[in-house]
């Protein structure tokens, strides 16, 4: 606890101290205060350097003195024989004896007092910046007039921050300006104008002077502009050494004058002004700005429009321009927007046709689609190209947008029919000779396969199931490859209206009308043992004359079984009508007069025993195309006979393409249209 | 030429267990259904079993109904019969058959149109 | 179970004879019956199918006739080698049912 005064005696005193003792006092008295220590009684053992015995002074780290030997004052007035001044409050005694004494030494007696100090005169470095003044226990610092003392309570300064200008012009000038300016000061200048305007600082080299650097180079007096986390400066030296117009890109500016305690100089003078923000002219590849100007600021609208062939892609919505808004910071609103390359995206796939991946899908790229040959071509031209338009579609040259339409080739066998012996009287056949031909398995029939949704039969075959189970794609019925095989399920049964439905079609002597159409829930994929076969033409050169030769198939009774369990086929030639009526009926149901014969009706067969027969029921009788060698056209449909390996009628197919193209059309779907 | 040989037949005392085998040749295998009829000595011919082409349909006579399993490899032409519990009744000469089966969902069958020479069983005591 | 009925259980005929054998289901079987012929020791041999078509290579003096319950199967013209047992098989439905065989002895 620090005391004002006090006393310290050596050990014993006033008696004889003993040997070989060290004993230290610690003097502290309050802060703000020196010590004065004194001594009125000396008397140790004297030595050089005072060696043996000593009583020690020690402030801090200094030694301010170290006493021995006998000691009287000089002053008859005063008792004092020694005494020390030191202006820190704090002080250390240390008294030590050795272990011999020749005399009997009575040591010493001491007394300090607080003091005041002058901390204004009595330090090397001066506590104030402007006045100091000194009172008892400590001081205090003042400013002259127009200064204020800062925080520190030291230093001394001029009140010139807090400025805030806010008008789109101004001039600011350092204070006192041109006089010179106030030391050891700190000016912040604030210029805040609106957002979308920049500030723009003018000076004249002239009106500037500031103390110059150092030899190190570094400002002892300094202006700085600070705009956001841009920097100019710092400045000093005669004349303003940076530049004369300062365009800070910022509506906000801050303007920081430091000075020291040296060296005042008239200082600075400037004005400023608001400049709208400008933006920058940028270049936007593949695009035209509407308008377009030399400099564009704050609140310029500019329109920017893609080249065809080029979009701007927002998300998922593609847009041919947009608008920009030079904004209050300098930038570009909708900036991240860029006219890119339209893209057409991946090729939509089509049915029975591919398109390879394009090495590109953007504007200018080019694809080709193709049909799966040979079973399907291209049904509405345009040769399969397209290339990406503008418009980000796809389009081909004749097309337009419109996909090409894959379909089925008809009428082409991948391998023709070869007669290898000699279905009655027919030959063994595969199923790749007759693709078309489809297998009904109750009754037990046959049918003709004319496109991916539709086949063609006789009205008897399905006018008590219409509901038939079909099948494509196998030479054999055995159930074991059948289940291997495509398997068509019905839609809908189109019986011909002028087909005659009876209670008993046991009994049947009409057969007149005898075709129907069954529409396909699916559609049928084709390939080497599916596809279809043609239709007639409706030309005269689709009419069959005697002789002309046709191929039946099918899985029908033969001369060695019921039910054929391979597919046998026979080529035979169309005959005259009457040979049909003469044949005698093998098992009539009713009297020979009362079976019908019409035109709807071809006659063919009769030679070599080759006849189509039961089981055979509703399969084609291919012709070869007039126009076309290559292909087949099913110019009939087996129906019934007389008498199987004699001749057999065959529904005449030509009869009936109006009705077959009208049923069709009105049952299609859309994905047909 | 078309073949089926039956193997696999011998004496068992009753309740014993048997395996027929029929190794078919000289035919798509599992393009046909098979059957296993038995004669037993100096009587008539009777229908066992029967599977389908591709085994997932079997039929049994009364007679052997769940002692009786009528099995096929196509990979191996072969027909199998497992005879369990087996009884002096079931003392016959045991012939495979092939079966055609024509059509698709609504089928045809043509039974029984090659024949095996048989293979004996003998149930005794 | 369908029963199928076959009579006469035996015959003597001569050689040249016709024959005739009936087989009688208990219920309508449609035409689903095949006959055979089984000469001893042998296995049996299918000769008609579909209660009337001739098995393949099958001499044409077998004929098949009849539907849904009655069915006849005829030799026109009886020769040697057609001694044997006769039997018919219904295959209408599971299980199959044979007929009980008919005996074809030499008169």
């Known amino acids: 606890e620090p005391t004002m005064y006090g006393e310290i005696l050596s050990p014993n005193y006033p008696q004889a101290y003993p040997s070989e003792v060290e004993k230290s006092w610690d003097i502290e008295v309050p802060e703000g205060y020196g010590i004065h220590l004194y001594f009125t009684h000396l008397d140790i053992e004297l030595s050089e350097n005072c060696a043996y015995d000593s009583v020690q002074i020690i402030s801090g780290d200094t030694e301010e003195g170290r006493l021995c030997g006998q000691r009287s004052s000089n002053n008859p007035h005063s008792p004092i024989v020694e005494e020390f001044q030191v202006p820190y409050n704090k002080l250390q005694v240390i008294f030590k004896s050795d272990f011999s004494n020749e005399e009997r030494f009575t040591g010493f007696a001491a007394y300090y007092v607080a003091t005041d100090i002058n901390e204004c005169t009595d330090f090397v470095d001066v506590p104030c910046s402007h006045f100091c003044n000194n009172f008892i226990g400590g001081y205090f610092c003042s400013c002259p007039p127009e200064y204020f003392l800062h925080d520190d309570m030291k230093n001394c300064g001029v009140n010139c921050s807090g400025d805030v200008f806010t008008a789109l012009i101004g001039e600011i000038a350092s204070p006192n300006y041109p006089k010179p300016y106030p030391e050891n000061s700190r000016c912040e200048y604030q210029i805040r104008l609106e957002k979308g305007f920049q500030v723009v600082v003018t000076l004249r080299r002239e009106d500037f002077d500031v103390e110059a650097a150092d030899s190190a180079g570094n400002c002892l007096d300094s202006l700085v502009f600070v705009a956001g986390d841009r920097q100019f400066g710092p400045y000093c030296g005669h004349g303003f050494p940076g530049p004369l117009n300062i365009e800070t890109k910022s509506n906000a500016l801050d303007i920081i004058f430091q000075t020291d305690l040296t060296g005042q100089k008239k200082g600075w003078k400037l004005r400023y002004h608001g400049d709208p923000m400008p933006c920058p002219k940028e270049d936007t590849p593949n695009s035209v700005w509407e308008p377009a100007k030399a400099k564009y600021v704050f609140r310029d609208v500019v329109q920017i429009t893609c080249l065809d062939g080029f979009e701007v892609v927002e998300g998922r919505v593609g847009a041919t321009s947009f608008y920009s808004t030079c904004q209050s910071n300098g930038k570009w609103s909708n900036s991240k927007l860029k006219c890119q390359p339209v893209d057409c995206g991946i090729p939509e796939s089509i049915e029975n046709g591919k398109v390879e991946d394009p090495e590109s899908t953007l504007f200018g790229s080019v694809i080709r689609y193709t049909c799966e040959e040979p079973y399907y071509y291209m049904e509405n031209g345009g040769g399969g190209e397209y290339h990406c338009a503008g418009n980000g579609s796809w389009v081909n040259e004749v097309l337009g947008p419109e996909l090409p339409k894959c379909v089925p080739v008809c009428g082409v066998p991948r391998e023709p029919f070869e007669e290898k012996q000699r279905i009655i009287g027919g030959s063994d056949a595969d199923i790749k000779n007759f693709p078309w031909q489809v297998f009904f398995d109750n009754p037990w029939a046959g049918g003709a396969l004319i496109n991916e949704y539709w086949v063609l039969t006789a009205a008897h075959v399905v006018e008590g199931n219409r509901e038939p189970t079909m099948y494509v794609g196998s030479t054999s019925v055995q159930t074991s490859r059948l289940a291997k095989s495509k398997m068509l399920t019905p839609e809908h049964v189109f019986i011909h209206p002028g087909w005659k439905l009876l209670e008993v079609p046991e009994g049947r002597t009409n057969f007149d009308n005898d075709i129907a159409l069954v529409r396909l829930k699916d559609p049928v994929k084709m390939g080497p043992t599916v596809s279809p076969i043609c239709l007639p033409g409706t030309s005269s050169d689709y009419n069959l004359m005697d002789g002309d030769l046709g191929l039946i198939s099918g899985w029908g009774r033969t001369e060695k079984r019921d039910r054929a369990v391979r597919l046998k086929a026979a080529r035979l030639p169309v005959a005259p009508l009457r040979k049909c009526k003469e044949v005698k009926v093998e098992k009539p149901t009713a009297d020979a007069e009362a079976y019908v014969f019409t035109p709807n009706m071809i006659c063919a067969g009769g030679e070599k025993g080759m006849d189509s027969c039961k089981g055979d029921s509703g399969g084609a009788f291919a012709v070869q195309d007039p126009n076309d060698k290559t292909k087949f056209y099913a110019a009939g449909l087996v129906s019934w006979g007389p008498q199987c390996g004699t001749y057999g009628l065959y529904t005449r197919v030509k009869n009936y393409v109006d009705w077959i193209m009208k049923t069709m059309q009105e049952n299609s779907t859309p994905r047909e249209d | 030429q078309v073949q089926l040989v039956e193997s696999g037949g011998g004496v068992v005392r009753p309740g014993g267990s048997l395996r027929l085998s029929c190794a078919a040749s000289?035919?798509?295998?599992?393009?046909?259904?098979m059957s296993w009829v038995r004669q037993a000595p100096g009587k008539g011919l009777e229908w066992v079993s029967g599977?389908?082409?591709?085994?997932?349909?079997?039929g049994y006579a009364d007679s052997v109904k769940g002692r009786f399993t009528i099995s096929r490899d196509n990979a191996k032409n072969s027909l199998y019969l497992q005879m369990n519990s087996l009884r002096a009744e079931d003392t016959a000469l045991y012939y495979c058959?092939?079966?055609?089966?024509?059509?698709?969902?609504?089928?045809?069958?043509?039974?029984?149109?090659?024949w095996g020479k048989g293979t004996t069983v003998t149930v005794s005591s | 179970d369908i029963q199928m009925t076959q009579s006469p259980s035996s015959l003597s005929a001569s050689v040249g004879d016709r024959v005739t054998i009936t087989c009688r289901a208990s219920?309508?079987?449609?035409?689903?019956l095949g006959w055979y012929q089984q000469k001893p020791g042998k296995a049996p041999k299918r000769l008609i199918y579909?209660?009337?078509n001739l098995q393949s290579g099958v001499p044409s003096r077998f004929s098949g006739s009849g539907s849904g319950t009655e069915f006849t199967l005829t030799i026109s013209s009886l020769q040697p080698e057609d001694f044997a047992t006769y039997y018919c098989?219904?295959?209408?439905?599971?299980?199959?049912?044979f007929g009980g065989g008919t005996k074809v002895e030499i008169k």
């Open positions: 579909t209660a009337s």
């Open positions: 599977i389908n082409w591709e085994g997932g349909s079997t």
């Open positions: 219920q309508g079987i449609r035409n689903d």
């Open positions: 058959a092939r079966d055609e089966q024509l059509g698709g969902k609504y089928y045809y069958y043509y039974y029984m149109d090659v």
């Open positions: 098989l219904q295959y209408r439905s599971h299980p199959l049912t």
């Open positions: 000289g035919f798509t295998f599992d393009d046909y259904g």
